[in-house]
Interface confidence: medium
């Protein structure tokens, strides 16, 4: 047990001893963040010049502040001690490690292309304003069908099986889908609203089946078809919207 | 088409002026985030920066060798870039090229064929 | 001011040949290079933005690499138009160029 204890006591003034020694062998190591040994001056330390920094202790230059010039504009300040940090100006966003780049800001429902802000084509959307339109989630994959169309800047949103919405089904009220994070109550209120009118076309057909004539029996069940029948997901189309195909890096639009 | 026409190079003695202009077309000086330098290339030699004005027109930078006695300024109206040149010295003569920074950095993405300027007695 | 030394600072190759030429920094300037082709008599052209990112329309047989203070621009096969002087630019702080670097015909 003391022999541990002296070992340690021993290890502890060896490193001292070592630290004490090296500071005056190199004075530089004693200077503090902030400042440089100045080779100039008999390493004396001094501190860095306007216009730049040593983030670390012992340094023998300063390095030159990040100027945030152009469209940069300074988010922090420069000091003796650490580096300016950029950001852009307004309309722009910071692109890359450390804000090197800034990229301009598109609105909603668009791209930005090398020709500028571009709007999304017809089955693509951006809900931000940066990066690139996306194509609308495939509803029928899921085998799912289209409650709300998409739109340049919003996705379609599924809902159930058109199955599930047949007025012709053994189940009336279709199954509540699960709730996905993010449904708003608008969602949940058009289930009910969908769940109700599907219930009173159900009644309405119940009734009216037995006293239509079968010419316009047919003309009947082909309009109650219509509501049930896949939406087509419209948008407004646009010249000069942007279309990213996967084999070409930017393609103009013919619609 | 983007482009820049530099003007009014020539010969000139030692201590004289001369007032250099470019001329933009298909794209505008005054939008916010587009900066426009002056570089200069002397004959035989690698690429120097010179001055550079900030797309609002607000903030002008200039390299130490130049401080002083060139001045880089702009007239939106006519879509032109100056440099005014003064006391003119025998290490000044070089082409001079004026160059677009990219409206969201802070590289030359877009240069004029140059003026040549000569300072000689 | 900050430094660039580019090296080599002229090389000789051949066509079809894979170049590579180095700039380093006198500090770390983050990704604030660019690369520039220059032809004689003619205006330098942007080839790489951001130390690695692709000037539009400039062929994908040049790349950039690197960041802080080492930064590399390679020619992956060498085409007879090629042959021109390439210079690296820092855009940190204030502006500054290398001193350049010649590829000539072997």
């Known amino acids: 047990m003391g022999n541990s204890c002296y070992n340690i006591v021993a290890t502890l003034l060896l490193v001292l001893n070592f630290e004490r020694t090296r500071s005056l062998q190199d004075p530089c190591s004693n200077c503090p963040a902030g400042t440089f040994c100045d080779n100039n001056r008999n390493q004396i330390c001094s501190p860095c010049p306007p216009n730049s920094f040593s983030s670390a202790g012992g340094q023998r230059t300063c390095d030159i502040c990040r100027q945030c010039k152009g469209v940069f504009r300074t988010r922090k300040e420069c000091s003796s001690t650490s580096n300016a940090e950029c950001d852009c100006t307004p309309g722009f966003h910071c692109l890359g490690a450390g804000c090197s780049m800034c990229e301009q800001d598109c609105k909603q429902g668009q791209e930005l292309t090398k020709k500028g802000c571009k709007d999304c084509c017809f089955g693509t959307f951006n809900d931000q304003k940066r990066g690139i339109c996306r194509p609308w989630t495939n509803c029928s994959l899921d085998g799912k069908s289209v409650l709300v169309n998409g739109t340049k800047e919003r996705d379609v949103v599924c809902g159930p099986s058109p199955a599930d919405l047949s007025p012709g089904a053994s189940s009336v009220t279709p199954p509540a889908p699960a709730r996905e994070p993010g449904h708003s109550p608008q969602i949940i209120s058009f289930f009910l609203a969908l769940t109700s009118t599907a219930l009173l076309f159900l009644l309405f057909f119940l009734t009216l089946r037995f006293s239509v004539v079968k010419r316009g029996r047919k003309k009947l069940l082909y309009i109650f078809k219509q509501p049930f029948m896949r939406p087509v997901q419209t948008t407004q189309e646009e010249d000069g919207c942007s279309c990213r195909f996967p084999e070409e890096e930017e393609g103009g639009c013919e619609l | 088409e983007v482009q820049l026409v530099e003007s009014g190079g020539g010969l000139v003695q030692p201590g004289g002026s001369l007032r250099l202009s470019c001329a933009a077309s298909g794209f505008s000086l005054s939008t916010g985030g587009v900066g426009v330098s002056w570089i200069r290339q002397a004959p035989g030699k690698g690429l120097e920066w010179v001055s550079s004005?900030?797309?609002?027109?607000?903030?002008?930078y200039y390299a130490d060798s130049v401080k002083g006695r060139f001045t880089i300024s702009r007239d939106n109206s006519k879509n032109t870039l100056y440099l005014q040149l003064n006391s003119l010295r025998a290490e000044d003569t070089a082409v001079y090229y004026c160059a677009r920074d990219d409206l969201y950095s802070w590289y030359f993405d877009v240069w004029g064929q140059g003026t040549l300027v000569t300072v000689s007695s | 001011d900050i430094q660039l030394t580019q090296s080599p600072s002229s090389l000789s190759a051949s066509v079809g040949d894979r170049v590579t030429i180095t700039c380093r920094a006198s500090?770390?300037?983050?990704?604030?290079l660019a690369w520039y082709q220059q032809k004689p008599g003619k205006a330098p052209k942007l080839l790489i933005y951001a130390a690695s990112s692709l000037q539009s329309g400039v062929p994908s047989r040049f790349s950039g690499s690197g960041s802080g203070t080492d930064f590399t621009l390679t020619i992956s096969s060498l085409q007879p138009e090629d042959f021109a002087t390439y210079y690296c630019?820092?855009?940190?702080?204030?502006?500054?160029f290398g001193q350049g670097t010649k590829v000539e015909i072997k």
């Open positions: 630019q820092q855009g940190y702080y204030t502006w500054t």
């Open positions: 004005i900030s797309g609002s027109g607000g903030t002008t």
């Open positions: 500090q770390g300037i983050g990704s604030s």
